[in-house]
Interface confidence: low
């Protein structure tokens, strides 16, 4: 399984997730990034197997964002880890 | 099956812009990124820079900051590639590449066939 | 920019051989790392990635290995289709960056 996910840096229009996870255990990583108490459809994401931390651009500001991760192979996906962030104001 | 398929070959004179293109079939566009390498005539092979069409920003590499735009068109699911004040040393084959994934540099899985650039006077 | 120093820069070998390429980082990359196959007038093709995992269709006479600094393609036994250029590739930190290649030659 994932180890943990961490928002690293946060700014007004971007932020930076970090993840751990086992080496070479898996083939991508799916991240969902949703507007947190909206109806908006979430945007989907896959990240190469080798990465542990990627730049989330094109956000918004002041806006409460729920981050999704999930691990893949190409039969298997992890339970998914989540974490809550609020971008900064402009 | 993911395809890329790139424009055709240029012949542009010195201090000119070349604009390549790569179409995307087979896949979802917009949620994985498209990078630019090029390699120059018996070289080797040097990342350019890469754009996330769901965002539409895009990233470049220090060497060719201020000289070459990347874009996409999430309608035709095509990425662009913008070469501008061009000079002898950009002759070369340019490659679009699809990352398997959401990142602008990564481990390129799929590749165009390649736009040959000439640049002569 | 992170390094890749490749070796070495060419090598001549026999079908049958086991051949072993290497690929130095300047600075550590985890397992941040893959290997591209690259014959003339054509795009690269992806073997490896994330250091030792097998593309998908490729045979299993390539294999990876290495963490941090330290990488290695090796072919186990050379066959007449491996003649071609040899990239690793560092995509651990942006920008990504190759070696400057391995071309493997026929004895």
């Known amino acids: 399984n994932l180890g943990e996910v961490v928002v690293a840096e946060v700014g007004w229009d971007a932020l930076k997730l970090n993840w751990t996870a086992p080496e070479g255990a898996y083939e991508y990583f799916f991240i969902q990034v949703q507007e947190a108490d909206t109806v908006e459809a979430a945007q989907n994401l896959t990240v190469p197997g080798g990465l542990r931390s990627t730049d989330l651009p094109g956000l918004k500001a002041a806006t409460h964002y729920t981050i999704t991760i999930r691990g893949v192979t190409q039969d298997f996906s992890t339970t998914p880890l989540s974490v809550e962030v609020l971008t900064e104001e402009v | 099956q993911v395809q890329l398929v790139q424009s055709g070959a240029e012949v542009k004179k010195p201090g000119s812009s070349v604009k390549v293109s790569c179409k995307a079939s087979g896949g979802t566009f917009s949620s994985y990124a498209i990078s630019w390498v090029r390699q120059a005539p018996g070289q080797g092979l040097e990342w350019m820079g890469g754009i996330i069409p769901i965002f539409g920003t895009a990233n470049y590499a220090q060497k060719f900051q201020g000289r070459v735009t990347i874009t996409a068109d999430k309608s035709t699911s095509t990425a662009y590639m913008e070469l501008s004040s061009l000079r002898s040393e950009d002759t070369a084959v340019y490659y679009c590449?699809?990352?398997?994934?959401?990142?602008?540099?990564?481990?390129?899985?799929?590749w165009g066939q390649g736009t040959t650039v000439t640049v002569s006077s | 920019d992170i390094q890749m120093t490749q070796s070495p820069s060419s090598l001549s070998a026999s079908v049958g051989d086991r051949v072993t390429i290497t690929c130095r980082a300047s600075?550590?990359?985890?397992?941040?790392l893959g290997w591209y196959q690259q014959k003339p007038g054509k795009a690269p093709k992806r073997l490896i990635y994330a250091a030792s995992s097998l593309q998908s269709g490729v045979p299993s006479r390539f294999s990876g290995s290495g963490s941090g600094t330290e990488f290695t393609l090796t072919i186990s036994s050379l066959q007449p289709e491996d003649f071609a250029t040899y990239y690793c590739l560092q995509n651990g930190l942006q920008p990504a960056t190759f070696g400057q290649g391995t071309k493997v030659e026929i004895k």
């Open positions: 600075q550590g990359i985890r397992n941040d």
């Open positions: 590449a699809r990352l398997y994934g959401y990142a602008y540099y990564g481990a390129f899985d799929y």
